[in-house]
Interface confidence: low
Amino acid sequence: NYQNGKNNVPRLKLSYKEMLESNNVITFNGLANSSSYHTFLLDEERSRLYVGAKDHIFSFDLVNIKDFQKIVWPVSYTRRDECKWAGKDILKECANFIKVLKAYNQTHLYACGTGAFHPICTYIEIGHHPEDNIFKLENSHFENGRGKSPYDPKLLTASLLIDGELYSGTAADFMGRDFAIFRTLGHHHPIRTEQHDSRWLNDPKFISAHLISESDNPEDDKVYFFFRENAIDGEHSGKATHARIGQICKNDFGGHRSLVNKWTTFLKARLICSVPGPNGIDTHFDELQDVFLMNFKDPKNPVVYGVFTTSSNIFKGSAVCMYSMSDVRRVFLGPYAHRDGPNYQWVPYQGRVPYPRPGTCPSKTFGGFDSTKDLPDDVITFARSHPAMYNPVFPMNNRPIVIKTDVNYQFTQIVVDRVDAEDGQYDVMFIGTDVGTVLKVVSIPKETWYDLEEVLLEEMTVFREPTAISAMELSTKQQQLYIGSTAGVAQLPLHRCDIYGKACAECCLARDPYCAWDGSACSRYFPTAKRRTRRQDIRNGDPLTHCSDLHHDNHHGHSPEERIIYGVENSSTFLECSPKSQRALVYWQFQRRNEERKEEIRVDDHIIRTDQGLLLRSLQQKDSGNYLCHAVEHGFIQTLLKVTLEVIDTEHLEELLHKDDDGDGSKTKEMSNSMTPSQKVWYRDFMQLINHPNLNTMDEFCEQVWKRDRKQRRQRPGHTPGNSNKWKHLQENKKGRNRRTHEFERAPRSV
């Protein structure tokens, strides 16, 4: 059955070389004295991407990242030496790794770095307008970076700068043990989470921070932190990691007598991303790696996309889960986690919850408490001892929307674009991996909008060497994706519709919401452009309905590639054919010489099928004829290649091997009469090369050819060898067999 596609594989897989050759990636390969291009800040208005790296801050042009400005911000020699004396690595640790890069106001950015284990912050002037072209460090104004940037560059930081105040989740000490969520800058006293209390934070790895409004009243605004941490004893048997979402009220100024300069509204809940397994045991993806908030229409209710990996070293897997803010809020309004009972296990708190409910932001909306400093003591006491919620937050549809477990990579980053297509709106995910590839995945609603099918459109290699992707930003204005890693920064378009092919069916099969068939090409789909030829079917990807009558004939350039291959009796030959789409299934047909009838090729000892094509072993005369390679995808059949195989009998070959050039040999003439003079130059030698059964090795064969060549050269001094490089060419061709079918222009394997 040819209908069943290979849905879990990317339809297109593009190597770094293919990406470069097709002008689909622009890379900034880093500076010799820098690395760690991990901290991104996108400024759509100025059309700049600011990137914090080792000892540098860059300002890249969003149109083309090859155009950039840079600020060098290293540490002093004294600081570097102190760091080295403390036993740190001079290259990997004793430098200024930029960890915080945020817009401070209309004219300045705020940046913090590790400062060689001595965190430091400053302001960067960027001017009022893009045309000001200002990008400079405020050298006169450096600030202590403690509680803003970690000391250790290996540690993750999550930060958010709003209304002149910096919220950061980071480590506040040299040893990297005192983790906290801080609020610094601004006019108020710094605030942090309770110190040395594992119930609040237990060795967290911070991922990101986001401001989300609760209501139309700004007093209810909350800052949400996403992180992963060690599960608290009793929460889980054995050492385990839990993914978390934490909340704090923006207007939390700490308590009056207790929790002074500490958060009084901090609450956290577990994020579950799991798939049901056999025997009722779920497979959990607990290692939260990245979060993306899709704000659409209602900023109070963004959809949260989370990238998770497994904790196990044995079972490597990744998943993407989606969460709704209404589910998050429901959990924060649910029971608190409480330790009780003889085993001191975690149970839902059943007692009286003080008023106003801990975690509620002080506002006139609820009970008239203007400030957290006015909260009753019992509220503060309860908040201190009950920071965690009992119920976890489950993903939409109770399962991941993307799962990858059968691959040699793990997910690291995600950005999502909501795309208007002909038949609805689709979320297109760009997922970064730890081997430097980007997956482009579209989630397609099946029966209901939350019952989603994942379609892996493309897998693109964006860096020359495998390197983990550590930062990603998406510009809707430029329709470009920006990717950061230790090695550098890459830029690629969100859509490259032309790569899908030159036929309506190929465009339709791609199921890329960005693309549609416009009557003559696969091109960018704009909902506003009322072009009637636009064909697109994201939901089903069915070309038979949408394209069946749009010609796939020769004058439209869809005729199959035609090749002639010569094989020697009793030897083997390989017919190469691999479709552009990895999701297509290939089947072969054989048509005997002078026969109309085509039969499907059955695999046996004589014929072996591979992903690259068909291997015919021990060739016989009856194998001569036409071999047709067809690709089948979603019921659509496309003929990719027609190979005419000519099998030469051994007797004939002996004749060719030993006949002199001057010799007549009617058989030779008969066999080569279809060839051009330039082809005749080398074809005779070539035919001997194909596993001639009477020659032990290629060396032996080449030796014979060269001897004969020398002999002929002596006999005819005026003869000029027209193909002195032919063996080099042949051997190169023997090497490069794993190629796409659109690269057929090669000699001498295809005459």
């Epitope: 609805g424 009557g519 009637r532 030829t533 309905t545 009558d549 749009l550 010609h551």
Partner: antibody, heavy 120, light 107 residues
Framework: AVTLDESGGGLQTPGGALSLVCKAS????????MQWVRQAPGKGLEWVAA??????WYGAAVKGRATISRDNGQSTVRLQLNNLRAEDTGTYYC???????????????WGHGTEVIVSS | ALTQPASVSANPGETVKITCSGG????????YGWYQQKAPGSAPVTVI????KRPSNIPSRFSGSLSGSTNTLTITGVRADDEAVYFC?????????FGAGTTLTVL
């Protein structure tokens, strides 16, 4: 078999509004473009409107007055025509495209038609 | 505008050809359809769509062919019940159009 049944025609008053419904059966309507074509008495065929999933197109004579919509669940296509004029009189046919292209070239099935008379 | 002859006539058994030109193109290719209407106000019947496709209920004596930008409807072995008005239809990106119709009279 593919069937298209139009309804909603009849005597209409100038300046009024008209709502025609086409009920489709025998095929999965959501995959195809649907069109409305009309014919004034003694005249030829005139294309009115077309809908393909979400995109819509209208003929010059009805642009700004017509709205075409579809309900794939109910397998219906609706044509709403406002500010009716005497020249809107005729038989209105619902038509299905053989593939998704909005063109008279691709119509492979027609409804029996519903007659509309605009008169005071 | 689509151009087609106003009328054609033929004796039973003869071959009739009706041409239609002036259609719009999709990506450089021209597409036409042919519709038979036996009486004014009665439902048209598609005899050819997409230049040469014939619906399953249409007899094989009806065929369509495209030459350049002109489409030809051919009825081989015309019969009395083929008497009708034949409209051609086409489109491009900006509009969908029908010809004025060709009246086929079977003598």
């Amino acid at each position: 078999a593919v069937t298209l049944d139009e309804s909603g025609g009849g005597l209409q008053t100038p300046g009024g509004a008209l709502s025609l419904v086409c009920k489709a059966s025998g095929f999965t309507m959501s995959s195809y473009e649907m069109q409305w074509v009309r014919q004034a008495p003694g005249k030829g065929l005139e294309w009115v409107a077309a809908i393909y999933t979400r995109s819509t197109w209208y003929g010059a004579a009805v642009k700004g007055r017509a709205t075409i919509s579809r309900d794939n669940g109910q397998s219906t296509v609706r044509l709403q025509l406002n500010n009716l004029r005497a020249e809107d009189t005729g038989t209105y046919y619902c038509a299905k495209s053989g593939i998704g292209l909005n063109s008279a070239a691709f119509i492979d099935a027609w409804g029996h038609g519903t007659e509309v008379i605009v008169s005071s | 505008a689509l151009t087609q002859p106003a009328s054609v006539s033929a004796n039973p058994g003869e071959t009739v050809k009706i041409t239609c030109s002036g259609g719009g193109s999709y990506g450089g290719s021209y597409y036409y359809g042919w519709y038979q209407q036996k009486a004014p106000g009665s439902a048209p019947v598609t005899v050819i769509y997409t230049n040469n496709k014939r619906p399953s209920n249409i007899p094989s004596r009806f065929s369509g062919s495209l030459s350049g930008s002109t489409n030809t409807l051919t009825i081989t072995g015309v019969r009395a019940d083929d008497e009708a008005v034949y409209f051609c239809g086409s489109a491009d990106n900006s509009g969908t159009a029908f010809g004025a119709g060709t009246t086929l009279t079977v003598l």
